[in-house]
Interface confidence: low
């Protein structure tokens, strides 16, 4: 057995470009030829332990054999040269690992960033995968000095080992090298100060102003390389519950600053702020956003009076009436602060006024049958709203003028109400509504609409398949006008139960059927029509359709002395429901008739 290899494969470390051809040779040593009684024609080539077809092999001379591979695609192949010693025993001569891949692409999109307080980081696009060990080296130099090379661990970025020097241009490029080639990116030339990403501003604080309820003052601390850089800011804000940010115009924050007053805000509203910074020239990178900070604008007096209405309770005596004044709490956007109380002033004709301070949203007063004017204002710690004024006429005055063409219809899960205004100028409209039920009283909700409105939706939480009684009242300077009402459904359904039919009168050949209207709680919609199905035990079923205004119907052409089964169904726009089955028998003879 020879200790030295019997021969060698050349090249010893083959690296092939994918898709190309490759030839290797195996050269046997003279001593080997004599020891094993062989020559190059005894050589067997193998890839990954599988014999290479003979057509790929060429015997060059007695010591040398070559093998050629076309269109190499496997990333790694174990290539061995073997001999058939003494004509039959296979002996390994030498082996190499053949690698395939691509030369590096020219790196592109080279960019660098100097994160404040850290060294410079450069990134690039290395291009296609090489499938080979490829070294990427970030090179950098001044016009007069070379900096240490940066060997990339990942092949797409490298952080240099030296601290950046500002206000001196640096040239940077990337060299990529593997066994198949070496290539360099385009170089980029820049001043590192123009690539700075500052640390985020910090200690952001927000303060409000008693004088102006529409502003908040911000202050913060900027780093900017310890004051070496002038930074401009980007400020964004949102209300506490909003998800989208509002941008302060960048032109307002272009000059270096550490404070700013945000204007045009809503009173008594909590806002959240964040801020970031960049070099004032706009070169470099925006910092990350600062930690968020919040503040609440100062209160302002309520921006409008509450919605205001009244109800007169039935009066037992003739001289007085009980009047319940009612109003709605202002939404936060109009209250502009915490409402402390409401001021109600009642004036009888032009005589003495009575003032009430109320913390709730209603006030019941006993009034004579004279005409009164009521005014209502909401108060917070800054001041009072404008007053809502309501005339309460004498009960002897008949209300004139009401809305016309009143309609209601569901759309987009809302119940809409529409009307034509009366011919006289209106101050406002009051809409009232309640669920009609035979099991519970009609508990009214209400809302106020401006004089210009003639279409709106009910703003309460409405239920499906409930019948709503809706009333619209125009309000004039002299008092309320006439009220118009209608019924409507947010969404109809099939009735909860069908009608229970009975016989009112049965004759030899006809029967009068009667039924009660389905209670409003079970109707679930507008009853449009009924169907009556009737049959004998052996005959086919007959069906008649009856208008919903009827509560009885006469079946004719019946057979005498016959048992009939009857059932009724009621239909809304959304479907029908059967009532219970009822049976009756026609007599054998008509009244006074003898067999």
């Amino acid at each position: 057995q020879l200790l030295e290899p019997c021969g060698y494969i050349y090249p010893e470390f083959p690296v092939v470009q994918r898709g190309s051809n490759f030839t290797a040779i195996c050269v046997l040593k003279e001593a080997c030829l004599q020891h094993y009684y062989v020559n190059a024609s005894y050589i067997v080539w193998k890839t990954n332990h599988a014999a290479v077809p003979r057509e790929q092999v060429t015997v060059i001379n007695r010591t040398t054999s070559s093998v050629t591979f076309t269109d190499v695609v496997l990333p790694s192949v174990q290539l061995t040269c073997n001999i058939l010693s003494f004509g039959q025993i296979e002996q390994n001569v030498y082996g190499v690992t053949m690698l395939s891949g691509f030369p590096p692409d020219k790196p592109t999109n080279l960019t660098c960033i100097v994160n404040e307080g850290k060294n410079m980081l450069c990134q690039w696009d290395p291009g296609r995968e090489t499938y080979l060990e490829t070294n990427y080296t970030l090179k950098s130099e001044w016009a007069t000095e070379k900096f240490p090379d940066c060997q990339s661990k990942h092949g797409t970025s490298c952080m240099v080992s030296y601290m950046p020097t500002y206000y001196v241009n640096i040239e940077v490029w990337v060299e990529a090298e593997n066994a198949l080639g070496k290539v360099s990116s385009e170089s980029i030339n820049f001043d590192p100060v123009d690539k700075v990403k500052p640390t985020p501003p910090y200690n952001l604080s927000v303060t409000n102003s008693e004088e102006l309820s529409s502003i908040l003052k911000l202050s913060w601390v900027s780093s900017g390389l310890g004051g070496l850089l002038d930074l401009k800011s980007d400020i964004q804000y949102r209300t506490k519950d909003a998800s989208t940010w509002i941008q302060v115009p960048l032109e307002d924050t272009m000059s270096p600053r550490t404070s700013f007053t945000v204007q045009d805000l809503k009173p008594f509203t909590e806002y959240v702020f964040r801020i970031r910074s960049i070099k004032d020239s706009g070169k470099g990178y925006w910092s990350d956003w600062s930690e968020e900070a919040s503040g609440t604008t100062y209160e302002d007096r309520p921006s409008r009076p509450p919605s205001f209405w009244y109800k007169t309770n039935p009066s037992h005596g003739q001289e007085y009436r009980s009047v319940r004044l009612i109003w709605k709490a202002l939404p936060l956007s109009e209250a502009n602060g915490k409402i402390l109380d409401y001021e109600v002033i009642l004036t009888q004709s032009k005589s003495v006024s009575q003032t009430y301070t109320v913390t709730g949203t209603e006030l019941t007063v006993n009034l004579t049958n004279d005409r009164y004017v009521a005014s209502l204002a909401a108060r917070n710690k800054v001041g009072k709203s404008a007053a809502a004024v309501l005339t309460i006429p004498s009960p002897h005055v008949t209300a004139a003028y009401s809305v016309v063409n009143l309609k209601a219809f569901p759309k987009d899960n809302l119940l809409w109400v529409e009307w034509t205004p009366p011919p006289k100028p209106v101050s406002k409209y009051i809409l009232e509504w309640c669920v009609l039920s035979e099991n519970a009283p009609c508990v009214e909700d209400w809302q106020q609409e401006d004089a210009t409105v003639n279409r709106t939706h009910l703003r309460g939480r409405l239920l499906e398949s409930k019948c709503y009684q809706i009333t619209v009242t125009p309000v004039f300077a002299t008092g309320p006008g006439g009220s118009e009402s209608l019924k409507a459904y947010l969404k109809q359904a099939a009735p909860a139960r069908g009608p229970t039919v009975r016989t009112k009168k049965v004759g030899k050949n006809e029967a009068v059927l009667a039924w009660d209207q389905i209670p409003v709680d079970d109707q679930n919609g507008f009853i449009r029509n009924y169907s009556i199905s009737y049959r004998t035990s052996v005959g086919k079923e007959m069906v008649v359709h009856v208008d919903s205004s009827h509560t009885e119907y006469t079946l004719s052409s019946l057979s005498s002395d016959t048992l009939y089964m009857v059932r009724m169904a009621a239909y809304t726009d959304e479907g029908g429901k059967d009532g219970p089955e009822f049976t009756f028998t026609t007599p054998k003879f008509a009244q006074g008739e003898i067999e």
Epitope: K182, S184, S187
Partner: nanobody
């Protein structure tokens, strides 16, 4: 084996002229970028001029613009540097360099792999 051989250096009076030559051998001349660089003792080697042998594009350092001209003769695999209006500060060792790895003309010395031995230029008053 890539080889670069400079010639044409020498001594000259301020305001005079010289023509440096650089002959390249050992690789395909067509795919090459050629540059002239100079070095004064105690200072970094600086780029003077460069040319793309394929397209003929050129670039010059600001200090030599209008005075120096880089050119080529591809039939002789040679690059020239014509130096007119020489100044005292033009004194130094002039090197010819070649690059096969770049794709645009540059006088960035870090992108050139192959260098000649240099030729001395001395400008006196």
């Amino acid at each position: 084996q890539v080889q670069l051989q400079e010639s044409g250096g020498g001594s000259v009076q301020a305001g005079g002229s010289l023509r440096l030559s650089c002959v390249i051998s050992g690789f395909t001349y067509k795919q090459t970028f050629m540059g002239w660089f100079r070095q004064v003792p105690g200072k970094e080697r600086e780029g003077v001029a460069a040319i793309s042998t394929g397209g003929g594009n050129t670039v010059y350092a600001d200090s030599v613009k209008g005075r120096f001209t880089i050119s080529q003769d591809s039939s002789k695999n040679t690059v020239y540097l014509e130096m007119n209006g020489l100044k005292l500060e033009d004194t130094g060792m002039y090197y010819c360099a070649a690059s096969t790895v770049i794709t645009s003309v540059t006088v960035n010395r870090g992108l050139y792999q192959y260098w000649g031995q240099g030729t001395q230029v001395t400008v006196s008053s």
